[in-house]
């Protein structure tokens, strides 16, 4: 099943997020992703855990998953590079870089997103944008078109409370509010964009969604700048 959902959001403006990618397994949406360079998409490592025997591809330039759109193109994956420290049983280091079979054809609907290199926490309360094709309600309805939601960043101390994530949020992770509006599971790999810059990637650990006491967890890309640069080099 697809890993992910945007809860409490709405349909995104078509093609206004040219960095948005759909990571697909055997032709079906699996996870979100974000174009960070002409030939590289950043996603979450856990997305490929169950994909050993399947064909992984990346869809760029899409708003609708099913309808024909001039900007849409499906790319094969030349190489999948999970973070070397990612493990199935932990949310830590949940990053994956996918090298496309060729450089993406750039245009208004396909363009890399600048990512944060300054390793500094986003101020609590900052409103950040999350987008994805995951299910949109607890009944499991899957949208055909890209959805998005604005979420406030939550301070790490609150996120680490015993009633919340109980100390699991390291300095390499960040949280956002999850009170009725939320990302979850496999919007996993999708971008958390603050002030027009990629700050976080939705983690793919399983957790209840839309519950204010279980905030959304995002991998801070600035904390992994050296690794990202080394892979893209």
């Amino acid at each position: 099943p697809p890993r992910g959902r945007i809860l409490g959001g709405r349909e995104a403006e078509a093609h206004a997020r040219p960095y948005m990618a759909s990571v697909q397994l055997n032709g079906a949406h699996l996870c979100g992703g974000v174009l960070v360079a002409e030939q590289w998409v950043l996603s979450a490592a856990h997305c490929l855990e169950d994909a050993a025997d399947g064909k992984v591809q990346v869809l760029l330039g899409a708003h609708s998953l099913s309808q024909p759109e001039p900007s849409k193109r499906l790319y094969d994956v030349l190489r999948a590079v999970p973070h070397p420290d990612s493990q199935p049983d932990t949310i830590d280091h949940d990053l994956l870089l996918l090298q496309l079979s060729e450089k993406a054809t750039l245009g208004p609907a396909v363009r890399p997103l600048p990512w944060q290199r300054v390793d500094r926490d986003v101020a609590p309360g900052t409103l950040c944008d999350v987008a994805g094709w995951g299910i949109v309600n607890h009944a499991g309805r899957r949208p055909d078109s890209l959805q998005h939601v604005l979420l406030p960043v939550l301070d790490r101390a609150t996120c680490n409370r015993r009633t919340h994530h109980d100390g699991a949020i390291t300095e390499r992770l960040m949280c956002a509010e999850s009170n009725r509006r939320d990302s979850c599971k496999g919007d996993s790999g999708g971008p958390l964009v603050c002030g027009g810059v990629l700050e976080g990637v939705v983690t793919s650990g399983s957790r209840v969604c839309g519950n204010r006491k279980k905030p959304g967890i995002y991998t801070r890309v600035a904390s992994y700048a050296a690794w990202i640069d080394s892979v893209l080099a």
């Epitope: 349909e11 403006e13 600048p114 987008a131 406030p152 009170n179 002030g195 204010r212």
Partner: antibody, heavy 121, light 106 residues
Framework: EVQLQQSGPELVKPGASVKISCKAS????????MHWVKQSHGNILDWIGY????????SKNQKFTGKATVTADKSSSTAYMELRSLTSEDSAVYYC??????????????WGTGTTVTVSS | QIVLSQSPAILSASPGEKVTMTCRAS?????MHWYQQKPGSSPKPWIY???NLASGVPARFSGSGSGTSYSLTISRVEAEDAATYYC?????????FGGGTKLEIK
């Protein structure tokens, strides 16, 4: 058409409190954040804070801690801001504002009509 | 917090002139918004995400910049452009505005 209609001018005494309102129309009130901005007489704009009317989640500029409280009433599609312990420094025009698009950026694309608060004995 | 400094505070120009006003941020931001305000009215969105004109804004306006330095340019000033222009950053809470540039037409 999205519209934000604010309550009328207020003349209040120092030390008192005032609650101003912002009634929204033309869109789903619970779908978007409502922000408040202060414009003092030097025409300086100060962001006060926001509220998510759907769940009550709010954030505030620390500068206004203890001064401003933002709330929202879903049933009437109205946002409120209460200002307390008023002094002459609080005399200003207060705006509600929001972003009603669906792009990756957000800005204040709709502003309220403004409420003038005058603090004077 | 990110402090935005606008210059000049007052700009005087004749119709048809090209004018540029600047907004400098105390820390790097990725995009900047601009608003226009005329006396007695609420601010109006004017330029969003650095260079995109809001609905109804004449094409003689343009925005540019990156990092800590942004600008709003009017290629040929007209009388109706007389107003105060404010920049605003949305990269980090608290969201801040510049002190404004008042454009006067000679």
């Amino acid at each position: 058409e999205v519209q934000l209609q604010q309550s009328g001018p207020e003349l209040v005494k120092p030390g008192a409190s005032v609650k101003i309102s912002c009634k929204a129309s033309g869109y789903s009130f619970t779908g978007y954040y409502m922000h408040w901005v202060k414009q003092s007489h030097g025409n300086i704009l100060d962001w006060i804070g926001y509220i998510d009317p759907d769940n009550g989640v709010s954030s505030k500029n620390q500068k206004f801690t203890g001064k401003a409280t933002v709330t929202a009433d879903k049933s009437s599609s109205t946002a409120y801001m209460e200002l307390r312990s008023l002094t002459s420094e609080d005399s200003a025009v207060y705006y509600c504002a929001g972003y009603y698009g669906s792009s990756w950026y957000w800005y204040f694309d709709v502003w309220g009509t403004g409420t003038t608060v005058t603090v004077s004995s | 917090q990110i402090v935005l400094s606008q210059s000049p505070a007052i700009l005087s120009a004749s119709p048809g002139e090209k004018v540029t006003m600047t907004c400098r941020a105390s820390s790097s931001v990725s995009y900047m918004h601009w608003y226009q305000q005329k006396p007695g009215s609420s601010p109006k969105p004017w330029i969003y995400a650095t260079s995109n004109l809001a609905s109804g804004v004449p094409a003689r306006f343009s925005g540019s910049g990156s990092g800590t330095s942004y600008s709003l340019t009017i290629s040929r000033v007209e009388a109706e452009d007389a107003a105060t222009y404010y920049c605003q950053q949305w990269s980090s809470n608290p969201y801040t505005f510049g002190g404004g540039t008042k454009l006067e037409i000679k």
